[in-house]
Amino acid sequence: DAEFRHDSGYEVHHQKLVFFAEDVGSNKGAIIGLMVGGVVIA
């Protein structure tokens, strides 16, 4: 039998990915990070 039509069983949560670079002073260089949903993860 063919399968009936259904969407994927896996939910997709859309979140904003924000890359940022922050200057923390000439002696320390810069921090590059990745923010996912408001949390810095890298």
Partner: antibody
Framework: QVTLKESGPGILKPSQTLSLTCSFS??????????VGWIRQPSGKGLEWLAH???????YYNPSLKSRLTISKDSSRNQVFLKITSVDTADTATYYC?????????????WGQGTTLTVSS | DVLMTQTPLSLPVSLGDQASISCRSS???????????LEWYLQKPGQSPKLLIF???NRFSGVPDRFSGSGSGTDFTLKISRVEAEDQGVYYC?????????FGAGTKLELK
């Protein structure tokens, strides 16, 4: 609120073509993921799924009846239609129009009141 | 076709008792997307069927928590923990994974 209402001829003779209309409100068949279908029930017996049509005009049929069934829609008028050719006494039943989506409403959450067909010579 | 076999076909119960209805599918009704489209509907005399449970164990909006669904693969159960008079009617299991979509023959719940 969501409502569905079936209409049909009531009585047909064997070999005639059945034309059913489902008029609905409270949702749109232009909405991605939405679908409307037909289920029938002979008096005092169980339920049999017939066909389903999706917002993008994709159609599914019961293979045992596919050669006799045609489902179609008019999204702008909020209507779905079912035609069954060459009816026989075995097609005597109550015909229900049902809503089912592919996403959040992926179940038969709303049913019409049903329209009764009698096939008799 | 996927055959849905319900037992018992008739279920006499007393008010306040627990009722249990079994539904077995002739083969797995796990869809390729990972979901199991097993549903339960109740049809009261003179009315259209109404949805109780979807995807095996999820109660539909407004359905009392006395109703619970369980199972997996090919073996499913509907339980009513404390039967009330308004629970009388015919209960149908249904699979929505494979074409044709198919219903069980129904279980008539009636009060003793």
């Amino acid at each position: 609120q969501v409502t569905l209402k079936e209409s049909g001829p009531g009585i047909l003779k064997p070999s005639q073509t059945l034309s059913l209309t489902c008029s609905f409100s409270g949702f749109s068949l232009s909405t991605s993921g939405m679908g409307v279908g037909w289920i029938r029930q002979p008096s005092g017996k169980g339920l049999e799924w017939l066909a389903h049509i999706w917002w993008d005009d994709d159609k599914y049929y019961n293979p045992s009846l596919k050669s006799r069934l045609t489902i179609s829609k008019d999204s702008s008028r909020n209507q779905v239609f079912l035609k069954i050719t060459s009816v026989d006494t075995a097609d005597t039943a109550t015909y229900y129009c049902v809503r089912r989506g592919t996403r959040l409403e992926d179940y038969f959450d709303f049913w019409g009141q049903g329209t009764t067909l009698t096939v008799s010579s | 076709d996927v055959l849905m076999t319900q037992t018992p076909l008739s279920l006499p119960v007393s008010l306040g008792d627990q009722a249990s209805i079994s539904c077995r599918s002739s083969r797995s009704i796990v869809h390729s997307n990972g979901n199991t489209y097993l549903e339960w509907y109740l049809q009261k005399p003179g009315q259209s069927p109404k949805l109780l449970i979807f995807k095996v164990s999820n109660r539909f909006s407004g359905v009392p928590d006395r109703f619970s669904g369980s199972g997996s693969g090919t073996d499913f159960t509907l339980k009513i923990s404390r039967v009330e008079a308004e629970d009388q009617g015919v209960y149908y299991c249904f699979q929505g994974s494979h074409v044709p979509l198919t219903f069980g023959a129904g279980t008539k719940l009636e009060l003793k």
